[in-house]
């Protein structure tokens, strides 16, 4: 899911050729190049599906495409949390999960994506024009949020074409610092490249352990994705606002997807692709921050307030959460 750049293996310079300084100037540009290639705007994608079997049941999937480690995911409906939305679930990679009705099953699908099922039990069921939002807090990117809802109409069983959705807000404090460093690095890289322009290029050889040198890969954000950064909050359709969940009406309809990545450059795959994509066992994740594999165990179906914490030996589970939301 994450953008990676694989750098060709460098052959150490021969003694006396460039010496220690030569080695440093040789490696540094490649390190900086890697940073420049991988440094892109983080993305959040949201997918909403109405189940064909349970016509008022929704599945929301959200993912974060960035290089940072996710510290918190907040799912809300009716709009962004803090802007008229209602928190449905809070997922923390170490502190666990809390959720509120009509959320039934919030869980980690991968270390950078989550899913949430909203039950359609008549009175408390969501409806088709409800807006669902996912906010990912990560380090060092900050907080990124995107919203999505089912499009007005679509063919049953088909995935709606991915469209750029707004990244609704970002905490720039963490982002600007990193961006500044990367910008400086990229400028410095250009400077080095210009300086080495008239020198003989260093000899690059494939790694001896593999017959073929891996190629550097990068994906540049499209113009559409760049523009997405400036799109304001989507207007919330109030005809089915979950202001009082006990009076919301169930909504029938076919099973179809609204796929809303924030960047057109990284489009999440449709349901068929997910089926073949290896996903960790239900409720498992890898803790990026401490480098430990932590098995979260079963994440049960929930229709009400739910909390998954792990005080047992299966993983570190400190319990002073940052949020007072459920």
């Amino acid at each position: 899911m994450r953008t990676e750049a694989q750098v060709p293996a460098l052959q150490p310079p021969e003694p006396g050729l460039e010496g220690a300084m030569g080695h440093r100037t040789l490696v540094l540009p490649w390190v900086l190049l890697t940073l420049c290639v991988t440094a892109g705007t983080p993305e959040v994608w949201v997918q909403v599906r109405m189940e064909a079997t349970e016509l008022s049941s929704f599945t929301i999937r959200c993912g974060f495409l960035g290089s940072g480690s996710i510290s918190l995911v907040t799912v809300s409906w009716g709009g962004p949390n803090g802007a008229g939305g209602t928190t449905l679930a809070v997922l923390h990679p170490e502190r666990g999960i809390r959720q509120w009705a009509p959320a039934r099953q919030a869980r980690w699908e991968t270390q950078s994506s989550i899913s949430l099922i909203l039950e359609g039990s008549g009175a408390s069921s969501p409806c088709a024009n409800t807006t669902f939002c996912c906010k990912f807090a990560s380090f060092p990117e900050g907080s990124w949020e995107a919203c999505g809802s089912l499009p007005p109409s679509s063919d049953p069983g088909l995935s709606a074409p991915p469209t750029p959705a707004p990244i609704l807000r970002a905490d720039l404090a963490g982002i600007l610092g990193v961006s500044g460093v990367l910008l400086f690095g990229c400028v410095y890289l250009l400077h080095l490249l210009r300086r080495h322009k008239h020198r003989p290029a260093p000899r690059l050889q494939p790694s001896r352990t593999s017959p073929q040198a891996p190629r550097a890969r990068a994906w540049a954000p499209s113009q559409a994705s760049q523009a997405a950064l400036h799109v304001p909050y989507a207007t919330i359709n109030t005809s089915c606002r979950p202001a009082t969940l006990d009076t919301a009406h169930p909504h029938g309809g076919p099973s179809w997807w609204a796929s809303l990545p924030t960047h057109a450059a990284h489009r999440p795959q449709g349901p068929a692709a997910w089926a073949s994509t290896p996903i960790p066992a239900r409720g498992s994740f890898v803790s990026v921050e401490n480098g430990l594999y932590a098995q979260a165990g079963e994440r049960p179906p929930h229709t009400g307030p739910g909390l998954t914490l792990f005080p047992d030996p299966r993983g570190p589970r400190a319990m002073e959460g940052p949020l007072g939301v459920r």
Epitope: T86, A101, P242, T308, L323, V325
Partner: antibody, heavy 119, light 106 residues
Framework: QVQLQQSGPELMKPGASLKISCKAS????????INWVKQRPGQGLEWIGW????????YYNEKFKGTATLTVDKSSSTAYMLLSSLTSEDSAAYFC????????????WGQGTTLTVSS | DIQMTQSPSSLSASLGGKVTITCKAS??????IAWYQHKPGKGPRLLIH???TLQSGIPSRFSGSGSGRDYFFSISNLESEDIATYYC????????FGGGTKLEIK
Amino acid sequence: QVQLQQSGPELMKPGASLKISCKASGYTFTDSYINWVKQRPGQGLEWIGWIFPGSGSTYYNEKFKGTATLTVDKSSSTAYMLLSSLTSEDSAAYFCARDGGLRGPFDYWGQGTTLTVSS
Amino acid sequence: DIQMTQSPSSLSASLGGKVTITCKASQDINKYIAWYQHKPGKGPRLLIHYTSTLQSGIPSRFSGSGSGRDYFFSISNLESEDIATYYCLQYDHLLTFGGGTKLEIK
């Protein structure tokens, strides 16, 4: 520090309505669900329902639908519960409680409001 | 709806002793249980959530365990200030309290 301050005791007549208040302080009011809990004399605790102050979304225990109405005033960080068509069955202590999210359910409570319904 | 059966409804123990309270759910609640201490004239106090996670500031004399449908709450080295009524709360599916256990000191 987090505090929930409830309105004082009430003596009401059957058929009347009463609005109990719960003023929150020490945290971001709009970020946490507020729950209401009933305790009849000598009996246990019963969950009435919750409200999310940020949006006004509510969810009720089936038993209390139609008799309890939850609202909030964001400007004063106050949650309210309106009890209508009071009967002697409504005589009880009523508590508001904040849902602490990842810190656990009902991590802070109000001191309670005692309601007596008598003719 | 999930029902919570709490037992015993009352118990008496000696200072310095240990007591255990049980809550049985009508279905698997996946460890989503919290325990509260309630004293007259006050709001209840959260002691433990997610079966065994001690709330900040709560002494380690209080502990919780269990899984599936059966859950246990214990107080060791009983002190006079522990006199109260204790409630379990399931929050796997909406919210349901147990009937309460009144603790007295012999």
